[in-house]
């Protein structure tokens, strides 16, 4: 997370850390708890070549990475069938946990938005994660969860910005309909935040608007952060994840 600050302990109870096996269980992406047994993340975190179930664990909301790990096993990794690269879209995936999480005030699910929600500019939105704090600058110990408030940008404006200084023709969309843009040169998500949630407060409820997906650098001029637009994939999500009763 570029800019922003350490998150208060009481906030973002749906935030999770994805861990890969190595010399230690290393954080590599974020995710969000959308059901007691399901985590939403980015497809590029776990695909297109899907890792072994044995190589992956989920850590629930933790103030400082690694300090009180209770890693959870995953029983299924579901990558969106249309995913190939983040830039093309469909950068969304689901992880099913072997056992449902015991929800509490500290750990609980985030609400998915209604299909009609557009998340217009001016809406109060935040992105969270344990990723880099600037380009090629790692989050330092004790690895606190960070938060930053990011401004939403309309897709057509974001697409026009991404065409500045790019070789892509103006008639070729860079920012697609299944994407959402947010951030500026002082506030952005970054490497290691991928898969994590972009949430917006709508009528008093935090809704997950996006999944950290891609961008050219972090907090670069004319290059806002790009997120997978959750509303675009609600039907796909609910094909697997039970709706709340």
């Amino acid at each position: 997370i570029v800019g922003g600050q350490e998150a208060p302990r009481s906030k973002w109870p749906w935030q999770v850390s994805l861990r890969v096996h190595g010399p230690y269980w290393m954080h590599f992406c974020g995710g969000s708890l959308i059901h007691p047994q399901w985590v939403l993340t980015a497809a590029h975190c776990v695909g297109p070549d899907v890792k072994d179930l044995a190589a992956l664990r989920v850590q629930l909301r933790e103030q400082h990475l690694y300090y009180q790990d209770q890693l959870l096993p995953v029983s299924r990794i579901i990558v969106h069938p249309q995913f190939y690269t983040a830039q093309i879209g469909a950068d969304i995936a689901l992880l099913e946990l072997e056992e449902p999480v015991n929800v509490s005030s500290h750990v609980h699910t985030v609400t998915l938005p209604p299909a009609s929600e557009t998340f217009p500019p001016g809406m109060p939105c935040w992105v969270t994660g344990w990723g880099d704090v600037d380009n090629d600058e790692r989050l330092p110990p004790p690895f606190p969860l960070k938060q930053v408030k990011v401004p939403i940008m309309e897709n057509h404006i974001c697409d026009a910005k991404y065409h500045l200084g790019a070789y892509t023709g103006d008639d070729v969309r860079i920012v697609r309909d299944d994407m959402l843009c947010a951030g500026n040169t002082r506030r952005d998500s970054c490497q290691g935040d991928s898969g994590g949630p972009l949430v917006c407060k709508v009528n008093g409820t935090w809704l997950q608007a996006g999944v950290v997906s891609w961008g050219e650098g972090c907090a670069q001029p004319n290059r806002p952060g790009i997120y997978t637009r959750v509303t675009y994939y609600l039907d796909w999500i609910h094909h697997y994840v039970p709706k709340k009763p």
Epitope: D52, S75, I77, E98
Partner: antibody, heavy 119, light 106 residues
């Protein structure tokens, strides 16, 4: 001592049913995913089914889906395999195994129980 | 479903020989697991996460590989190594084992 002891095997007619049990001791049974693996006479190992620590997740080999049911009773430290509509090709030694907590290999195996399906 | 193919199905070797068993997965996996089984006995865990030796396994055993191709190697075969070895993946369900490789005395 960490131990798994299977029981319930025997001779059963085709189309019949059998329930295998596996008694666990020497470890906190409720912390571990458990697996059944079988081995037909003179053949290799075949994975049968998996159950997660709290029974929320179960998976079966395709040939056993719909006929076999894996379950567990954590209060009794016991794993079960209910086998229905048995066929001659289900004849095998059935092993109960524990999935290692950290590394996902099958680190503890029972001695096995022989199931013979024959008329 | 991922299929596992071991080769050879059986091999004859002498004490002191270097022995290599291969296991090929039908699609890419991260890790391979190996088990040893002797006649009339339950299988024993032998190698996990491709190259880590299970408790009590002698250092003459090693495991390697990535993607779809993995190997178990015995640098100098000993009398107690004559057994059948099985590979297994833990990529996704259903889990599958290789058909086994029987190591026999020449």
């Amino acid at each position: 001592e960490v131990q798994l002891v299977e029981s319930g095997g025997g001779l059963v007619q085709p189309g019949g049913s059998l329930r295998l049990s596996c008694a666990a001791s020497g470890f906190t049974f409720s912390d571990y995913g458990m697996v059944w693996v079988r081995q037909a006479p003179g053949k290799g190992l075949e994975w049968v089914a998996f159950i997660s620590s709290g029974s929320s997740t179960v998976y079966y080999a395709d040939t056993m889906k719909g006929r076999f049911t894996i379950s567990r009773d954590n209060s009794k430290n016991t794993l079960y395999l209910q086998m229905n509509s048995l066929r001659a090709e289900d004849t095998a030694v059935y092993y109960c195994t524990r999935r290692n907590y950290d590394d996902r290999y099958f680190d503890v195996w029972g001695q096995g129980t022989l199931v013979t399906v024959s008329s | 479903d991922i299929q596992m193919t071991q080769s050879p199905s059986s091999l004859s070797a002498s004490v002191g020989d270097r022995v290599t068993i291969t296991c090929s997965a039908s699609s890419s996996v991260t890790y391979m697991y190996w088990y040893q089984q002797k006649p009339g006995k339950s299988p024993k865990p032998w190698i996990y996460r491709t190259s880590d030796l299970a408790s009590g396994v002698p250092s003459r055993f090693s495991g390697s590989g990535s993607g779809t191709d993995f190997t178990l190697t015995i640098s100098s075969l000993q009398p107690e190594d004559f057994a059948t070895y099985y590979c297994q993946h833990y990529h996704s369900y259903p889990l599958t084992f290789g058909q086994g490789t029987k190591v026999e005395i020449k």
